[in-house]
Amino acid sequence: FERTRSLQDPCSNCPAGTFCDNNRNQICSPCPPNSFSSAGGQRTCDICRQCKGVFRTRKECSSTSNAECDCTPGFHCLGAGCSMCEQDCKQGQELTKKGCKDCCFGTFNDQKRGICRPWTNCSLDGKSVLVNGTKERDVVCGPSPADLSPGASSVTPPAPAREPGHSPQ
């Protein structure tokens, strides 16, 4: 079948990085500069994407693959193939219709993008709050309140992250 197809359509023999040139008796011609074809049998090459302005080149265009862009510092990619760059906020904030706003009490965001999320409810796991939450950080849950009672007989030392005077990483 492949042989039959190629006899009927000489363009099917043109590999990625070339196009089937109708002006030159359907021979396979290399893609011109700043263009590419990512599949074989193409009758034209696609224009390379140019990463300009807020968009930075993450991967250069080649004869067989398009350029890939990301965003300049202060922005992050949105959309398929980084079609847009959304502005960052600070940790402890979220982007709303009115701009970057601090997380409400009881919520946090440890990234420069995304939304504020509620602090973990330690009591749901039968634990107590070891380190309070902030706008930038979730709470750290510790042992259950019963484990901390004066009569507790456990002699197992706490995990390093729970040592007094050390903040968890």
Partner: nanobody, 124 residues
Framework: QVQLVESGGGLVQPGGSLRLSCSAS????????MSWVRQAPGKGLEWVSD????????FYEDSVKGRFTISRDNAKNTLYLQMNSLRAEDTAVYYC?????????????????WGQGTLVTVSS
């Protein structure tokens, strides 16, 4: 409804200056990035410059860097393009355009509203 109205174009000698304005209405101007795009006679659209919603981040096409300055006055809902050291190749219709999402800079294909354009002719 969204409206973008450019003004300030005209005939200027090489080396001269012009300041384009774009008056915006019908949306919360201060929440959207804005752009200038131009079209030279017989050519396609060419991106010129972007400015983010707050005005602190600006971006330029290489050929206009150091000569053009984009700015905005969110209190007046107005976008500007200060054009200095103008060259014959800057002759074009200049359009202002609005980006589609708040606090986001898009590619030119995704701009959702455009003005009617103002003609800039650089000639001696």
């Amino acid at each position: 409804q969204v409206q973008l109205v450019e003004s300030g174009g005209g005939l200027v000698q090489p080396g001269g200056s012009l300041r384009l304005s774009c008056s915006a209405s019908g949306f919360t101007f201060s929440s959207y990035a804005m752009s200038w795009v131009r079209q030279a006679p017989g050519k396609g659209l060419e991106w010129v410059s972007d400015i983010n919603s707050g005005g602190e981040s600006t971006f330029y096409e290489d050929s206009v860097k150091g000569r053009f300055t984009i700015s905005r006055d969110n209190a007046k809902n107005t976008l500007y393009l200060q054009m200095n050291s103008l060259r014959a190749e800057d002759t074009a219709v200049y359009y202002c355009a609005k980006h589609p999402l708040t606090f986001t800079i898009a590619t030119m294909n995704d701009y959702d509203y455009w003005g009617q354009g103002t003609l800039v002719t650089v000639s001696s």
